[in-house]
Interface confidence: low
């Protein structure tokens, strides 16, 4: 038999919080446990859902959860079937709600003395305890003529008097909890004592020296006071005005008429209404000054025949927001058309070459009227004057290729060479006829060249060919002043190109001839030994049949180059003591000793006491510090060559002498010892 | 229909240039419209970057002004923008749109391309 | 330049129900230069309204648009569930043209 060991049992719930109804069974066979509410099978969900037997609610809702559930066991071999006893909840919950009329049927039936009831449609279980509110004060029974009941949701009024005004709210309570009224009620009743509005005053822009008028009117049994109030507080009557106002009429309708506006004037009025009860009822309108600003300029428009193209006119800052038109030849656009107004835009649809000229934007509002003009042309394809023509330009020399078109507006022209944009530099120069210059022609200027002349409409382009006419020149020139090293072999080349391949010879300058031992050949000039009287002064030709002859003259020195016969060492010296880098070169010209130590040259002049430079070129540091240490070069040089050899020094602490030292004994590393 | 589509990459070291690239399809860029460019960070608002008319005319924000070049390329049909001297703060999403005739505001949007800087 | 801003930056409300967002102006912006978009998750925005109160082609009726000066206004009378998306009101009377913050309309 199938016996339940816990029965689900029927318990208080809260509203959107969590539940169980415990189900457990025993049973000889193996049986499958299912629940019912209200005899239906409960499907299982996010919300309720089987937990082993039991039925666990992960939020409890007073709507989809009331009813009876029933625990249903089934052995499905044996089809015995065992229900348990039935459960329900009694779900507690709040539910906020608005206040609403109750009685009369509608707002529009409120009257003085009428009895009015408002209802707090706030809901719940157990039934809530309810407490009104006035303006966000407690009401209590017996109030100020009003009957509460704080069992029920109903607040009467009886009678319903002005001193009842005010926004009524409500909150309630009960085991769940607390809510408040989600929308809450105004309700106005009115007292004929107190001024209401009849009329408002609306706010005016006028012109200057205009008038402006406002209307004002309230109701009130026995009749309201009406007063006009400007800006500072100072009242406006027919007696007293203020200075600003002497042209002020207040009327016996309570209008205020103002003549011959001045932008003082210019501000907010008010119009105060007085009731025998109740407070003042205040209306507020402003008077405006019109008023229109400049309007910004427009830049010169240039578009293409058959385009359609817009202008927007921004219109001026104003008051009133100023009213837009366009015209063009003294006419107003019409708002259809080829060329046509659209809101503030001029609309020009298919271009065409006549519609080029000045179109004028106009504004205007009570202020007067303001106007700009925007030039538009219509552009044209160029058209050539002068085409670039083929061209030998002579290297060296200035050399211009043309590029003269005509259009509407100004055509720009740009210049390509070998498909690359030219951009102005030093060497090219595009005048504002299109006219290219090339300021220094060169060899390898010798190319294609395309100018395109374009305008919005359009482009042409023509090209040509550069021919450079080279000039007769060394290449490269020879250096005027040249060594040669003594008893060795030598040679000195001279090379020149030119519009026909020039031949080249060498000569002395004195115009000896050259000794047997030196050969000229194609331009070199080779010296199998140099000799001390091969120095001095020769001169290269080049020359050829239509250019002439050109010459380049150098100076030769015979020179024995230069060789260490003493070399600094690497040397080591103890802190204090002084260093001592030797260094010896010859050479012919006799070479010029440097030194330079960490990486900058030394300055005889500047050395200072303790380094000292010796006429043979040897170095000598005194008094030796750590920061000493690095790598000194010995630079030797003269006008034909230099040389430069380079050692390490180093500065070392002196050891303290132990005992077991004699005074003899040696230092560990090889000294200078001075 | 008017349609844009934005290309460009979607990573840009700091201190680096953006180059983005939008195609224009099913109009031409020598309509008269302007073509923009706007750019929205994660989580935050819009801000207009620039615009190009296809003659090269440009408008720049000035907030933006001395990093950006906007260029166009009628042949091709697309405009680009180049944004340098990126910063973390130029991580967004960056759209190409297309103005109403004559009017700055945006008719035709490309669907965006996300570029974030970081090294 | 100018700067525009938007509130509420959040409006949470029901479908069916009637959305109002506004738009603010730093400076006067002329009644013809302000538009209004909406933006769904991941997309780009979509022009609404243009010259402050003229629905873009293919908007529906229920989108409409009022204001001048400094002050303007978005209203969808009958919130529809796709409409709980991002808006974004922009000037384009002064450069640079500048956008607002952003109102995000959410289900209440």
């Known amino acids: 038999a199938i016996v339940f060991i816990k029965q689900p049992s029927s318990q208080d719930a809260l509203q959107g919080r969590r539940a169980l109804l415990r189900c457990e069974v025993e049973a000889p066979g193996l049986v499958h446990v299912y629940w019912l509410l209200d005899g239906a099978p409960v499907q299982d969900t996010e919300r309720r859902f089987t937990q082993g037997s039991s039925l666990s609610f992960a939020a409890v809702d007073r709507l989809q959860d009331s009813g009876t559930f029933q625990c249903v066991a089934r052995d499905d071999v044996t089809g015995e079937e065992a229900r348990s006893a039935n459960a329900s909840f009694n779900i507690k919950w709040i539910e906020a709600g608005p206040v609403v009329l109750k009685h009369p049927a509608s707002e529009a039936e409120i009257q003085p003395q009428t009895q009015v009831t408002l209802r707090c449609h706030i809901d719940g279980h157990p039934r809530p305890t309810y407490q009104w509110f006035r303006d966000g004060t407690p009401l209590s029974d017996g109030q100020s003529n009003n009957t509460v009941s704080s069992k029920e949701r109903n607040l009467t009024l009886r009678p319903a008097g002005p001193e009842h005004s005010g926004l009524y709210s409500c909150c309630a309570h009960n085991a769940f909890g607390q809510a408040c009224s989600s929308q809450n009620f105004t309700l106005s009743i009115a007292d004929e004592s107190f001024a209401r509005v009849v009329l408002a005053p609306q706010d005016v822009i006028v012109a200057r020296n205009e008038e402006a008028m406002f209307h004002c009117q309230f109701s009130a049994q026995p009749p309201p006071n009406l007063q006009w109030l400007f800006e500072d507080e100072t009242p406006i009557t027919n007696r007293s005005r203020p200075p600003h106002l002497r042209r002020a009429t207040v009327f016996a309708n309570g209008s205020l008429l103002l003549t011959q506006v001045r932008p003082r004037n210019a501000g907010v009025y008010r119009c105060i209404g007085q009731g025998q009860r109740g407070p003042p009822v205040i209306l507020e309108a402003t008077l405006h000054l019109a008023e229109i600003e400049d309007m910004p300029l427009f830049e010169p428009r240039v578009f293409t025949a058959g385009s359609e193209e817009r202008v927007t006119c921004l219109p001026p800052k104003g008051l009133p927001e100023p009213s837009v038109w366009w015209e063009h030849a003294g006419v107003r656009l019409p708002t259809h058309g080829r060329v046509y107004q659209k809101g503030h835009e001029l609309v020009l649809a298919s271009i065409a070459e006549s519609d080029a000229g000045v179109y004028t934007c106009h504004a205007a509002n009570l202020a007067g009227q303001r106007r700009q003009d925007v030039n538009i042309t219509v552009a044209t394809v160029p058209t050539w004057l002068k085409k670039p023509q083929d061209s030998q330009l002579e290297e060296g020399k200035p050399g211009y290729l043309h590029c003269l078109t005509q259009a509407t507006p100004k055509p720009t022209v740009v210049w390509y060479r070998n498909q690359m944009l030219i951009s102005e530099d030093s060497r090219f120069e595009v005048f504002k006829n299109g006219t290219l210059r090339i300021n220094n022609v060169e060899v390898y200027d010798g190319t294609w060249y395309r100018c395109v002349s374009s305008t919005p409409a359009g482009s042409i382009e023509a090209q040509a060919r550069v021919q450079v006419l080279e000039k007769l020149k060394f290449t490269p020139p020879p250096q005027p002043q040249q060594c040669m090293e003594f008893d060795k072999e030598a040679t000195v080349p001279c090379s020149a190109t030119g519009r026909e391949k020039p031949t080249i010879k060498w000569e002395r300058a004195d115009g000896s001839s050259l000794p047997e031992w030196v050969t000229d050949n194609a331009g070199t000039l080779h010296f199998a030994r140099v000799t001390r009287d091969d120095a001095g002064n020769y001169t290269c030709i080049a020359s050829n049949g239509p250019q002439g002859q050109i010459r380049a003259h150098v100076q030769l020195t015979v020179a024995v180059f230069i060789t260490f016969k003493v070399e600094p060492e690497r040397t080591t010296v103890y802190q204090g003591h002084t260093a001592l880098l030797q260094c010896e070169a010859q050479g012919d010209p006799k070479p010029l000793i440097q030194w330079k130590g960490k990486d900058r040259i030394l300055d005889p002049t500047k050395l200072g006491p303790r380094m000292h430079i010796f006429q043979n070129g040897s170095l000598v540091i005194h008094d030796v510090a750590p920061e000493d240490s690095g790598r000194y070069t010995c630079i030797a040089g003269n006008s034909c060559n230099i040389k430069h050899t380079e050692a390490p020094l180093y500065v070392v602490d002196k050891p303290v002498p132990e005992e077991s030292e004699g005074p003899g004994s040696p230092p560990p590393y090889k000294m200078i010892q001075t | 229909q008017v349609q844009l589509q934005e290309s460009g990459p979607g990573l840009v070291k700091p201190s680096g240039t953006l180059s983005l690239t939008c195609a224009v399809s099913?109009?031409?860029?020598?309509?008269?419209?302007?073509w923009s460019w706007v750019r929205q960070p994660p989580g935050k608002g819009l801000e207009w970057i620039g615009e190009?008319?296809?003659?090269?005319?440009?408008n720049y924000n000035p907030s933006l002004k001395s990093r950006v070049t906007i260029s166009v390329d009628k042949s091709k049909n697309q405009f680009s923008l180049k944004l340098s001297s990126m910063t973390a703060a130029d991580t967004a999403v960056y759209y190409c749109?297309?103005?109403?005739?004559?009017?700055?505001?945006?008719?035709?949007w490309g669907q965006g391309t996300l570029v974030t800087v970081s090294s | 330049e100018i700067v525009v801003t938007q509130s509420p930056a959040t409006l949470s409300l029901s479908p069916g129900e009637r959305a109002t967002l506004s738009c603010r102006a730093s400076?006067?912006?002329?009644?013809?230069?302000l538009a209004w978009y909406q933006q769904k998750p991941g997309q780009a925005p979509r022009l609404l309204i243009y010259?402050?109160?003229s629905r873009a082609t293919g908007i529906p009726d229920r989108f409409s648009g009022s204001g001048s000066g400094t002050d303007f206004t978005l209203i969808i009378t009958r919130l529809e569930p796709e409409d709980f998306v991002v808006y974004y009101c922009?000037?384009?009377?002064?450069?640079?043209?500048?956008f607002g913050q952003g109102t995000k309309v959410e289900i209440k």
């Open positions: 010259g402050t109160s």
């Open positions: 922009q000037q384009y009377g002064t450069s640079p043209r500048t």
């Open positions: 190009i008319y296809h003659s090269g005319s440009t």
């Open positions: 400076q006067s912006v002329s009644s013809s230069y």
């Open positions: 749109a297309r103005d109403e005739s004559g009017y700055d505001y945006f008719d035709y």
């Open positions: 099913g109009g031409s860029i020598s309509s008269i419209n302007w």
